[in-house]
């Protein structure tokens, strides 16, 4: 008896993080075999949508051509051959961002800093959010969250780092976000760049941390050190 | 051939109840979101609810702990139970089928004829 059929790769173009009002494409690639490509969003009633597949059959275009709230979520989909529904993809999150107003993101004392000295970034909203967000360009892992622990909403986060090696140098932004959704987040703040001076010891993972060999630093996510502030926020790392 | 039919619309005082029922063929209702939309004389179309294959719902904004929306897979059929009705809840009431996305545009791949339901005293 023939085992399950394989589950279908499920991707989006030019991205997963998508600025409101632009087009996005989600692309589902299950076999030759495929009939029928499914695609489901979480919370919403399915399917979501229906797609015949393009030739050679073995994948199905999805389109949005306006990105809106509605479109924010967790993605499955799946492909229907003449043996039956494929195992669902591995999910999707598709995120918009532009549904609030942007953040101001800052460096205290300043974005100027010593090697092995502490600085803080500081997301600050205009109103009370309960999710900030951090990001390094070009990072593979860029995402920080400070969440709010039970719903308080905050105008600010700190992202404390300590201290600080060349590894933490280079262009941030920040999010801010409501709970209810974590798929809408507000428009980037304006970047950051943060230069590191006065950097002599190698950046590279020391042997005694479990990280993967093949992974340069650029390639670990941004985790400073120090308390969480006693703002009513929690770290979570993405 | 009809593929989507109504049922159950008419006249009743505010406060009161109507249950309407709408009939799909079998390939229409085990494959697709059911729903209801609504269109008020001078209004833009209005989508009410709607309800997945695995029976997961969506209630219109207008309408939230008024009106509930259940399918019954053995009888192909989609219902809009409609409580503590207003008379802003007068307008002609659409069944619908399609994929989810395109109840979001407007634009389900099937329609009933409609039904009439008027709220007045």
């Known amino acids: 008896q023939a085992g399950p059929l394989p589950k279908p790769t499920l991707w989006a173009e030019p991205g997963s993080v998508i600025s409101w009002g632009n087009s996005v494409t989600i692309w589902c690639q299950g076999t030759l075999e495929a009939r029928e490509y499914r695609l489901d969003k979480e919370e919403s009633p399915a399917p979501w949508d229906r797609q015949n597949p393009l030739e050679p059959k073995n994948k199905a275009r999805f389109s949005i051509p306006s990105m809106t709230e509605d479109y924010a979520g967790r993605y499955r989909c799946y492909y229907r051959s003449p043996v039956g529904w494929s195992q669902p993809s591995d999910p999707l999150e598709l995120v918009m961002t532009g549904a609030y107003s942007k953040p101001t993101l800052s460096a205290l004392p300043s974005p100027l800093v010593t090697s092995g000295k502490s600085v803080t970034l500081l997301c600050q909203s205009r109103s009370p959010m309960d999710t900030f967000l951090l990001i390094k360009e070009r990072a593979a892992h860029p995402l920080l969250h400070l969440r709010s622990e039970h719903g308080a909403q905050q105008h600010q986060a700190e992202f404390p780092m300590s201290p600080v090696t060349s590894v933490h140098g280079g262009t941030y932004r920040c999010f801010s976000s409501h709970g209810f959704s974590h798929y809408l987040l507000s428009h980037p703040s304006d970047p950051l760049e943060l230069i590191v001076s006065g950097s002599l010891e190698d950046p590279r993972p020391s042997p005694t941390r479990s990280v993967s060999t093949a992974a340069g630093p650029e390639d670990q996510p941004l985790m400073p050190t120090g308390s969480v502030p006693h703002s009513g926020l929690r770290r979570h790392w993405e | 051939e009809v593929q989507l039919v109504e049922s159950g619309g008419g006249l009743v005082q505010p406060g009161g109840s109507l249950r309407l029922s709408c009939a799909a063929s079998?390939?229409?209702?085990?494959?697709?979101?059911m729903g209801w939309y609504r269109q008020a004389p001078g209004k833009q179309r209005e989508l009410v609810a709607a309800?997945?294959?695995?029976?997961?719902?969506k209630i219109g904004d207008s309408v939230k702990g008024r009106f509930t929306i259940s399918r019954d897979n053995a009888k192909n059929s989609v219902y809009l139970q409609m409580n503590s009705l207003r008379a802003e809840d007068t307008a002609v009431y659409y069944c619908?089928?399609?994929?989810?996305?395109?109840?979001?545009?407007?634009?389900?791949?099937?329609w009933g004829q409609g039904t009439q339901v008027t709220v007045s005293s």
């Open positions: 619908a089928a399609g994929a989810y996305v395109r109840f979001l545009q407007y634009s389900p791949d099937y």
């Open positions: 079998e390939s229409i209702f085990s494959s697709n979101v």
């Open positions: 309800v997945g294959i695995q029976g997961l719902t």
